[in-house]
Interface confidence: low
Amino acid sequence: MGRARDAILDALENLTAEELKKFKLKLLSVPLREGYGRIPRGALLSMDALDLTDKLVSFYLETYGAELTANVLRDMGLQEMAGQLQAATHQGSGAAPAGIQAPPQSAAKPGLHFIDQHRAALIARVTNVEWLLDALYGKVLTDEQYQAVRAEPTNPSKMRKLFSFTPAWNWTCKDLLLQALRESQSYLVEDLERS
């Protein structure tokens, strides 16, 4: 991707020294999605904008890292900067306009990953299953599992078969599926995120 990382760096480099310090402090207490760790405080406070961008992307990956950065900026009262970051991140990806905010994290069911929350909708609405399989093959799907899903006759039955393997997945594996969904059917993910 790269675009999100550049947008995060651009936003952080435009903060004053005092704002950057405030950003780091807010980052220590901002609510995180379940399954994501917090950047250790001692490491965080000594970082410049470039190091912090690398850490944000390393900890949260680009998509969530940009979203989290925008949330913190908004919390600091820097609405315009947050909007610019989201606009730059979503440019050309068919995502919602920057003004539309994702629902607050507290609204999500605690402990449930996005793909578990929206299991029924994903089974019903995902059409590009083959693409997902290719993205997940060798990472979270074995050859046997890959073939088993492909053998199903319809997209819903393919997705149902795919979901039969997810109870054994950890958060990271589920994130891979979510990432693949974002890349193949971003409009569907955004629709579900707003629901």
């Epitope: 207490s29 399954g35 994501y36 760790g37 917090r38 950047i39 250790p40 405080r41 001692g42 490491a43 470039l50 190091d51 690398d54 850490k55 390393s58 900890f59 949260y60 990956l61 958060w171 990271t172």
Partner: antibody, heavy 119, light 107 residues
Framework: QVQLQQSGAELARPGTSVKLSCKAS????????LSWVKQRTGQGLEWIGE????????YYNEKFKGKAILTADKSSSTAYMELRSLTSEDSAVYFC????????????WGQGTTLTVSS | DIQMTQSPASLAASVGETVTITCRAS??????LAWYQQKQGKSPQVLIY???SLEDGVPSRFSGSGSGTQYSLKINSMQPEDTATYFC?????????FGTGTKLELK
């Protein structure tokens, strides 16, 4: 699969230095932090510090500043820890461990290197 | 530094028994806690991360819970292969700090 291969056991004299290595394979070296952990015989674990190869910026436990120097060689996917001015207190098993940032834990560990400091 | 107080220091349990190990942090660590198992002469291995997430391949008899400063590791049905030393570790702040360890033996 992910592997962290540490260098062999070391016997060193007090006052000297030693450099331990940890060769990573099976993953993108620059994408994860590598930590070093000390364990004295029959005792607990102490975090020495972490090096994050992408930005080559080590963080140290204050207790080990000046004692340990952490470096990383991206070309060989190897992390190093040099221990200086050795004393008997440095006799321990030293582990390198990959820091999985998305859960704040060490998901893979090296087999450990035993350091004995004795005259 | 954040202090991690682990208890008990040692315990013995029979096969099938439920075991609970606790860890108290000197300040709120916001779920940034992992539990490790270390068998004699081996490297530690992660069991639980982010306070309650089970690492891949770890038997489901292991579970983690807690929040704020209080956390615990539960082994639902003790097995002979669970004989080991268990450590908690906080990663909320640098330096990362470990609990003193709990040595679990088979009764």
């Amino acid at each position: 699969q992910v592997q962290l291969q540490q260098s062999g056991a070391e016997l060193a004299r007090p006052g000297t230095s030693v450099k331990l290595s940890c060769k990573a394979s099976g993953y993108t070296f620059i994408s994860f932090g590598l930590s070093w952990v000390k364990q004295r015989t029959g005792q607990g674990l102490e975090w020495i510090g972490e090096i994050y190869p992408r930005i080559d910026n080590p963080y140290y436990n204050e207790k080990f500043k000046g004692k340990a120097i952490l470096t990383a060689d991206k070309s060989s996917s190897t992390a190093y820890m040099e221990l200086r001015s050795l004393t008997s207190e440095d006799s321990a098993v030293y582990f390198c461990a990959r820091y999985f940032t998305k859960g704040n834990y060490f998901d893979y560990w090296g087999q450990g290197t035993t350091l004995t400091v004795s005259s | 530094d954040i202090q991690m107080t682990q208890s008990p220091a040692s315990l013995a349990a029979s096969v099938g028994e439920t075991v609970t190990i606790t860890c108290r942090a000197s300040e709120n660590i916001y779920y940034s806690l992992a539990w490790y198992q270390q068998k004699q002469g081996k490297s530690p291995q992660v069991l639980i991360y982010y306070a309650n997430s089970l690492e891949d391949g770890v038997p489901s008899r292991f579970s983690g819970s807690g929040s704020g400063t209080q956390y615990s590791l539960k082994i639902n049905s003790m097995q002979p292969e669970d004989t080991a030393t268990y450590f908690c570790k906080q990663a909320y702040d640098v330096p990362f700090t470990f609990g003193t360890g709990t040595k679990l033996e088979l009764k």
